[in-house]
């Protein structure tokens, strides 16, 4: 707290520039108003104020805001969000994405802070839904943003959203994750011919049934490895021999390097050995 | 409730055959998507898997003792069992059969059954 | 074959205390890891499969974590009933292969 004491002549603040970084901590609490720092918040992060003078002017916007900041000066906190606790920002109200994207450029390279964590929930749960505009921003500042949500709430992401998710974006999601993500990911491309589609399900299908890979066996879409040893294990048990030489085309080769690992090795046990040797690779069921 | 139990001789002779059998009740150790496993645990010390089975008679067993294990299934009793071979003092632990279901984890262990090797 | 390490190897920690255990695994494993909580002269009992799924029956207090080599099991308020012994193990390739264990005691 800094205590209340009376604003020097000639010292009170008519507007937010630089002189005002010579003020003492107790000078900037007596001499610049809480109304005209709100309206003048754009000007603070052009001025190199100290991390101690910054916090006497969040103390002046929690005084005159203590039920929460309004977006105006939310939209141009600029380096000062970066002074606020997840307390502060859960007050907040911020339907705007030009306010998020403002905020979320101050945290720019550094991993998702509390406060940026809790900004993202209260924005995303006042849109009510996870769109793409908004999942377009989120997953550009941080790739990893669809697999850090849980399953419940990746259920509120529409199959339109889907159009933004990069394969990227997908690299740290578990399995329950693309359970949640693949049945949106079919739907949202549902429309597109066989090549096209498998290309963009193609980091989704860790979350895909055994019917679903029986189908895309019989579209000659060369699954890579890579791929394969993403999908589910009890979706790819039920696989016959036959399906998953035409799943992976000329990969098939492969699956003698992945004999001890998961799901290849499950799927090599269920298999009998006769059908095995039909692929000329030395696997021993 | 699927349950396991392990039944064998508590004290073996070196250089002899340890011999294990696991009962499988209230489920089919024909499961199509379970492999039924043999783990060990030496007094005081951690786990260490020896190998599993599939109904189909398809094993896989840790190298570490791959040249002296054999694992076996009856399906008609419901059974599988262990065999090790060749056994020294070293070889003295709980012995757990354990069913590793869809879920690829351990979700059904015997209660254990421990086994000295002296003479 | 890959190597499971967990850290640390004990612990002490009173009742109502947060708990982490970590497993690293020497190459990438997926998500292919499980915890079990083991009490003396008793089976290994499953607590997480899957690094974050809860097995059925197990209190919503263990929570599972990670993916690739690190991962992480968490108590978030330790009941007497939860000390033992805690390993992890990894169910990606054979051989399979198990944490050297975290015994969690009263402090």
């Known amino acids: 707290e800094v205590e209340k004491t009376a604003c020097p002549s000639g010292k009170k603040a008519r507007e937010i520039d630089e002189s005002l970084i010579f003020y003492k901590k107790w000078e900037l609490e007596a001499c610049v108003d809480a109304a005209l720092l709100a309206t003048q918040m754009d000007r603070v992060n052009a001025i190199p104020f100290t991390y101690e003078q910054l916090d006497v002017l969040k103390h002046k916007l929690d005084e005159l805001y203590p039920q929460g900041y309004p977006e105006s000066v939310i939209q141009h906190l600029g380096y000062l969000f970066l002074k606020m606790s997840p307390e502060d920002i859960r007050k907040w109200n911020v339907t705007s994405l030009e306010t998020l994207k403002a905020l979320l450029e101050v945290n720019k390279g550094h991993e998702m802070s509390p406060q940026v964590a809790t900004l993202i929930d209260r924005f995303v749960k006042g849109r009510g839904q996870l769109d793409k505009d908004t999942l377009d921003t989120l997953t550009a500042f941080y790739p990893g943003y669809l697999c850090s949500l849980s399953p419940e709430e990746l259920s509120s992401v529409p199959p339109s959203s889907i159009w933004a998710v990069r394969p990227q974006d997908l690299d740290t999601c578990d399995p329950r994750q693309l359970d949640v993500l693949y049945p949106k990911a079919r739907l949202a491309f549902q429309n597109m011919n066989g090549s096209e589609y498998f290309v963009k399900i193609q980091s989704f299908l860790g979350g895909a049934p055994t019917e679903d890979l029986k189908a895309l066996s019989q579209q000659n879409v060369s699954m890579d490895l890579a791929t394969f040893m993403k999908l589910r294990t009890d979706a790819v048990l039920p696989l016959t021999v036959a399906e998953v030489q035409k799943l992976l085309g000329p990969h098939v080769e492969g699956l003698k390097a992945e004999e001890r690992h998961r799901p290849v090795r499950d799927w090599i046990l269920r298999q009998r050995q006769d059908d095995l040797d039909t692929l000329g690779l030395g696997l021993q069921g | 409730q699927v349950q396991l139990q392990e039944s064998g001789p508590g004290l073996v002779k070196p250089s002899e055959t340890l011999s294990l059998t696991c009962t499988v009740s209230g489920g089919s150790v024909s499961s199509f998507t379970d492999t039924w496993s043999w783990i060990r645990q030496p007094p005081g010390k951690g786990l260490e898997w020896i190998g599993y089975i599939y109904y189909s008679g398809s094993t896989n067993y840790n190298p570490s003792l791959k040249s002296r294990v054999t694992i076996s299934v009856d399906t008609s009793k419901n059974q599988f069992s262990l065999k090790l071979s060749s056994v020294t003092a070293a070889d003295t632990a709980v012995y757990y059969c354990?069913?590793?279901?869809?879920?690829?984890?351990?979700?059904?262990w015997g209660q254990g059954t421990m086994v000295t090797v002296s003479s | 074959d890959i190597q499971m390490t967990q850290s640390p190897s004990s612990l002490s920690a009173s009742v109502g205390d947060r708990v982490t255990i970590t497993c690293r695994a020497s190459q990438s494993i997926s998500s292919y890891l499980n915890w079990y909580q083991q009490k003396p002269g008793k089976a290994p009992k499953l607590l997480i499969y899957a690094a974050s799924s809860l097995q059925s029956g197990v209190p919503s207090r263990f929570s599972g974590s990670g993916s690739g080599t690190d991962f992480t099991l968490t108590i978030s308020s330790l009941q007497p009933e939860d000390f033992a012994t805690y390993y992890c193990q990894q169910s990606y390739s054979t051989p399979l292969t198990f944490g050297g264990g975290t015994k969690v005691e009263i402090k």
């Open positions: 354990a069913r590793e279901g869809k879920n690829g984890a351990f979700d059904i």
